[in-house]
């Protein structure tokens, strides 16, 4: 059962698995969320009757029942983890503590202007966790303006006090607001020699990788896989850190992989979400449950739905025992992950699937591609929104892209001459415009925020937020698009579609079925040379064939330019103006999203 | 019981030299890689050098062209020659077998099998 609302002058009694350092109780709720054993907590707001010593102390609690017994105590706030949600969840917090000193190891300090100017430092900063700053009205001289950035074992406070003009907050990397450097590459057969600060157990060197993403010390990993000679340590997945946060030594190794972590584009992979299946692989662990199941897949259903189940192992049935049945082993560890992996022994093993909200839902796989052909089948594009106008009357204006469930990003140029939002209808999960009745369900539009930088298309800031009046529920075909990483800037992407319903040539009409073309990126150096009465700034992408013939047209603008990479899609481009359509030597030019990422967040949220 | 015994630890001159030595017992010494990481007060876990069981070499670069790494997989034992000595590189030092790293704040961590440590003092 989901319980999202706080008690107040609670204490839950007993189940103390440990305690953490947070500003606020709704920081206590979400680190209790990403503890792997914490379903609910205790915080204990400052307050003159509590010992100064309990202010800011966060008890992370479990519970076989899920609950505890409540207990009446002034200045205690209780409650739940939100694992047992099934909403979105995100890690990022943006909230400015004033007045409260959050300690750890002050391992930077410098000058800065602003507190943002200093949680903007923190965020770029590698080792950052969280900051103190002191404001101009601090009493001592020379510590005013200084800026401390911190870091702790938890990610988390190692005691919080009262300190009058001093502000402090946390890094904003889950948040995806970090500029640091996005290095998806694992490389084989090294060894990262660097210091441990954890080990784990892993299937695989992917899972070894997400486990160190979202570990708020580990910077880099390395993994033995089952091959390795070793046995002992076959399995491992080793948690590294280094002072200049890079590895310093690599060791040439067989059957062993290292790799980064990607907190700096957590919010464009899945981190939580270890969706594959392990064959003949036997996870051990503290056994929760054994029950029949028919297959592996409902075992990994009953794992998902079973609150304190972490991973499961199947034995599948023997010939006609059971009704066919086999058995699902649900299990947890202290950590969430196995306490030891075996192989051989003809199980197949999988991760809780509960965690899969903690990541952003336009990681999730869509359904896969269909080759050839210029017409999209449903689902093929599910993040693809037909934009209308019903003035004068009702008609397809512009393509766009759902990249939040409240929001749609589009190009600034397709509302020339709109007075107001009224007038719009987002249309989503459609493949035929034939498909739009009267009485066919639609998103109104709220509000209308073009970038106030635009003026035209060809001189670029061609893009544009809409916010609709109701929320998206995602499915199969309507769900998010993944906006580009900022650590993904060198990124060369090889697998990009322009979609939407615009016209076919030039002199044409809005097509009925929703069309895509795979088009090759191209050089802003080369676009420029097919450009020469433009400027093409590093804010445009471009996209074309030099033979030309496939390109984005009239009724196209808005929609996507939709690169896939690494098995997850990105919003590279919005189609934005080309001379003329598909022409020799004319690439189609797009708003460079990845410039955009900043002004989206801002907009999006915004309180 | 795995056992790794460290000596040749001592103090001495910058510029001089020491040899480190460490004698290995209770496993396959053959088949191990093994390393030597350092620590000095104050700060992180360092490491050294390291050499692979088939004798494959790499160093830190703050000690590359000074110290060589050698194993006697006869005699169950893996040297450290230290030359040109400075005075940040006095400090503890650790021999390790299959370690892949020390640990955040002491060298000795549950990865791998580790000695007790030998003393090395540089003076200017």
């Known amino acids: 059962e989901c319980v999202t609302q706080l008690l107040k002058d609670t204490c839950f009694e007993g189940g103390d698995i440990t305690t953490v350092f947070t500003p606020s109780a709704k920081y206590c709720q979400v680190v209790c969320t990403y503890h792997p054993r914490c379903l609910l907590f205790t915080f204990t707001a400052e307050s003159p009757s509590e010992d100064p010593t309990r202010w800011f102390t966060c008890v992370l609690k479990d519970s076989v029942t899920e609950t505890l017994p409540r207990v009446n105590r002034t200045a205690a706030i209780s409650g739940y983890s939100f694992k047992q949600c099934s909403h979105q969840i995100s890690a990022c917090n943006k909230d400015i503590y004033v007045d409260l000193d959050m300690k750890g190891i002050n391992y930077n300090s410098s000058v800065a202007k602003s507190a943002q100017e200093c949680q903007e430092r923190c965020t770029d900063d590698v080792h950052c966790h969280f900051f103190t700053y002191a404001t101009r009205q601090f009493p001592s001289l020379e510590h005013r303006n200084i800026c401390l950035l911190k870091h702790t074992q938890t990610g988390t406070p190692t005691r919080i006090t009262k300190l009058d003009k001093v502000v402090s907050g946390f890094s904003l990397k889950s948040c995806a607001l970090s500029n640091l450097a996005c290095i998806r590459d694992i490389f084989p057969n090294t060894v990262f020699a660097d210091s441990n600060i954890d080990s784990v157990m892993a299937p695989d060197a992917f899972v070894c990788g997400r486990i160190c993403t979202h570990h708020p010390g580990c910077l880099f990993f390395t993994f033995f896989s089952q091959e390795w000679p070793k046995e002992s340590q076959r399995n491992l997945c080793l948690l590294k850190t280094s002072e200049s946060g890079l590895p310093s030594t690599r060791i040439k190794k067989s059957k062993a992989l290292s790799g980064f972590s990607l907190q700096s584009c957590r919010h464009s992979i899945p981190v939580f979400c270890h969706s594959s299946f392990y064959h003949d692989t036997d996870f051990l662990g503290e056994e929760l449950d054994i029950v029949a199941a028919k297959s592996h897949e409902a075992c990994q259903k009953l794992c998902t739905n079973a609150v304190r189940c972490q991973f499961f192992t199947y034995t599948p049935a023997q010939a006609s025992c059971n009704e066919g049945k086999g058995k699902c082993y649900l299990k947890l560890s202290s950590n969430g992950s196995p306490t030891k992996i075996l192989h051989g022994r003809g199980g197949i093993s999988g991760y809780t699937l509960r965690l899969c909200k903690m990541d952003n839902e336009c990681t999730t796989k869509i359904k896969p591609r269909i080759v050839g052909g210029t017409a999209s089948v449903r689902g093929e594009w599910p993040w693809q929104v037909t934009l209308h106008t019903t003035s004068p009357t009702q008609r397809h204006l512009c393509g766009g892209s759902i990249i939040g469930n409240q929001w749609i990003l589009t190009a600034a140029h397709c509302f020339y001459g709109v007075e107001s939002p009224k007038i719009l209808r987002v249309y989503s999960g459609i493949l035929n415009q034939s498909e739009i009745k009267e009485d066919t369900s639609f998103f109104g539009v709220q509000e209308i925020i073009i970038h106030d930088q635009y003026k035209m298309a060809e001189s670029g800031y061609d893009i544009a937020l809409l916010k609709l009046e109701t929320t998206v529920n995602y499915t199969d075909s309507q769900r998010p698009i993944c906006l580009p990483s900022k650590g993904d800037r060198n990124v060369i992407y090889t697998d990009c579609w322009v979609t939407g319903w615009g016209y076919r040539k030039l002199r044409d009409k809005i097509q009925n079925t929703l069309q895509k073309a795979k088009i090759p990126l191209v050089t802003n150096e080369e676009c420029q040379k097919r450009y020469r009465g433009h400027k093409i700034t590093h804010k445009m992408i471009c996209a074309g064939y030099r033979e030309g013939g496939k390109d984005a047209c009239k009724g196209d603008s808005g929609g996507p330019l939709s690169c896939k990479h690494n098995e997850v899609w990105h919003l590279v481009g919005i189609t934005s103006w080309g001379e003329g359509c598909a022409q020799r030597e004319r690439p189609g030019v797009y708003t460079n999203v990845v410039e955009y990422v900043d002004w989206i967040l801002e907009k999006t949220q915004a309180v | 019981q795995v056992q790794l015994q460290e000596s040749g630890g001592d103090s001495v001159q910058a510029g001089g030299s020491l040899r480190l030595s460490c004698i290995a017992s209770g496993f396959t010494f053959d088949d191990s890689d093994m390393g030597w990481y350092r620590q000095a007060p104050g700060h992180q876990c360092e490491f050294v050098s390291h050499i692979t069981n088939d004798g494959t070499t790499y160093y830190a670069d703050s000690v590359k062209g000074r110290f060589t790494i050698s194993r006697d997989n006869a005699k169950n034992t893996v040297y450290l020659q230290m030359n040109s000595l400075k005075p940040e590189d006095a400090a503890v030092y650790y021999c390790?077998?299959?370690?892949w790293g020390g640990g955040r704040s002491t060298c000795v961590n549950p990865i791998g099998y580790w000695g007790q440590g030998t003393q090395v003092t540089v003076s200017s």
């Open positions: 390790a077998a299959d370690a």
